[in-house]
């Protein structure tokens, strides 16, 4: 009988005596086998000990010379921890960052909503100056055009799922020269006809620009 084999153990064939070196019917385990953790369940004024391979949620395994035991996580807003001062899972609504729990991620870090962790975000440089106002690669011949500014990605995010902020943006601008030097003026009727064409061209250019920005962001 394997219970009799260990002379040091005072086992009762009871499931709560699993892993015990010393056990009683009323109080369960009072000492555990070497690699197990002692946990004391308290119910009102009564208690019984258990020997566990891993500690319950809210506790961590504390190794001690006399006996390993489960000890309570005392890190603010922490649900489970690895040690006295390193959290592994925060309470709902808090983000995990370097073993601590925060209500928002520190600067330069982005929240991963599926794991509620703060990971290194996408780092971008400063905006460039606004570019020249142009349309159809021309800087004259139209009343309105678009000017663009850009910024570089300094550091790629730790995970591909973290989006980078916009790295290029455009805005409507008034051309410096509506008429190109040496160009012929069009009659009023022709001007009206071309107005519709021009509006459509701007719309299409803006659409293409949006598509370009979106694909550019995906490629990053």
């Amino acid at each position: 009988n394997r219970w009799r084999r260990n002379k040091r153990a005072s086992y009762v064939s009871n499931p709560i005596c699993k892993g015990c070196l010393s056990c009683s019917k009323d109080n369960g385990c009072s000492r555990c086998q070497q690699k197990l953790f002692f946990f004391l369940r308290r119910e009102g004024m009564r208690q019984y000990g258990e020997c566990l391979h891993s500690c319950p949620s809210g506790y961590y395994g504390h190794r001690a010379p006399d006996m390993n035991r489960c000890a309570r996580c005392r890190i603010e807003n922490c649900d489970s921890c690895f040690s006295k001062d390193f959290c592994t899972k925060c309470k709902v609504g808090f983000y995990l960052h370097r073993g601590r729990c925060f209500d928002e991620c520190p600067d330069g870090f982005a929240p991963l909503d599926e794991t509620m962790e703060c990971v290194e975000g996408c780092e971008v440089g400063h905006w460039s100056e606004w570019g020249t106002c142009s349309r159809n690669n021309r800087t004259c011949g139209f009343k309105w055009g678009l000017e663009t500014r850009t910024r570089q990605i300094v550091k790629k995010p730790a995970k591909d799922t973290i989006p980078c902020p916009t790295i290029a943006e455009s805005r409507r601008c008034k051309m410096a020269m509506r008429h190109c030097p040496g160009g012929k003026r069009t009659p009023k009727a022709k001007e009206k006809r071309n107005k519709k064409k021009r509006r459509k061209l701007i719309e299409r250019a803006q659409e293409q620009h949006s598509v370009f920005l979106a694909t550019d962001r995906v490629n990053q």
Partner: antibody
Framework: EVKLVESGGGLVKPGGSLKFSCAAS????????MSWVRQTPEKRLEWVAS???????YYPDSVKGRFTISRDNVRNILYLQMSSLRSEDTAMYFC???????????????????WGQGTSVTVSS | DIVMTQSHKFMSTSVGDRVSITCKAS??????VAWYQQKPGQSPKLLIY???TRHTGVPDRFTNSGSGTDYTLTISSVQAEDLALYYC?????????FGGGTKLEIK
């Protein structure tokens, strides 16, 4: 710095009542269990009462039904109401942080990690 | 109730000596033992909990050993300021109980 200051002790006649308090500062009072421990004139320490952070109360049989522990988490004050006092209740009463019989912590809060300076109670006719 | 017995009411020692204060529980208390020091005119102070863990700020000359029912508080090199009453307490099951105390006297 954890600070516990008791007040309200004094001389009471047998059968009489007394309520004293312990003002806590320097820690998150509402998060901790609190206890009362007394020291007899012979210097023996005896556990008197405990209250969990959630308000559950625990007493030894010697004071059950006569003593009531309570707490005010807004004002950070622990109380002990004593009635039907006996001569054997004569002691120095200390308030202490920790010692919750209802919760296992596996750390310092299972013991009583900080104590006040104590308040003296004498029950005599 | 669990009875905690400190067999020596008084212990006399000299500065620099190693001293051991013993405590015996009436049943196995699973290392759930705390030690307190009470200096003259002061309130008790926690030294050790869970049999071997020193409380914040406690000098490392204070150690505890033991398991089951027998526990020993050892001061490796006694200092003049260690003159005090020492109590053991079990925090295993209610009612919490204390030993009768051991008064450490410096020769």
């Amino acid at each position: 710095e954890v600070k516990l200051v008791e007040s309200g002790g004094g001389l009471v006649k047998p059968g009489g009542s007394l309520k004293f308090s312990c003002a806590a500062s320097g820690f998150s009072f509402s998060s901790y269990a609190m206890s009362w421990v007394r020291q007899t004139p012979e210097k023996r320490l005896e556990w008197v009462a405990s209250i969990s952070s959630g308000g559950s109360t625990y007493y030894p049989d010697s004071v059950k039904g006569r003593f009531t522990i309570s707490r005010d988490n807004v004002r950070n004050i622990l109380y002990l109401q004593m009635s039907s006092l006996r001569s054997e209740d004569t002691a120095m009463y200390f308030c202490a942080r920790g010692g919750d019989p209802g919760v296992y912590n596996g750390d310092y809060e299972d013991a009583m990690d900080y104590w006040g300076q104590g308040t003296s109670v004498t029950v005599s006719s | 109730d669990i009875v905690m017995t400190q067999s020596h009411k008084f212990m006399s020692t000299s500065v620099g000596d190693r001293v051991s204060i013993t405590c015996k529980a009436s049943q196995d208390v699973s290392s759930a033992v705390a030690w307190y020091q009470q200096k003259p005119g002061q309130s008790p102070k926690l030294l050790i909990y869970w049999a071997s863990t020193r409380h914040t700020g406690v000098p490392d000359r204070f150690t505890n050993s033991g398991s089951g029912t027998d526990y020993t508080l050892t001061i490796s090199s006694v200092q003049a300021e260690d003159l005090a009453l020492y109590y053991c307490q079990q925090h295993y099951s209610t009612p919490w109980t204390f030993g009768g105390g051991t008064k450490l006297e410096i020769k």
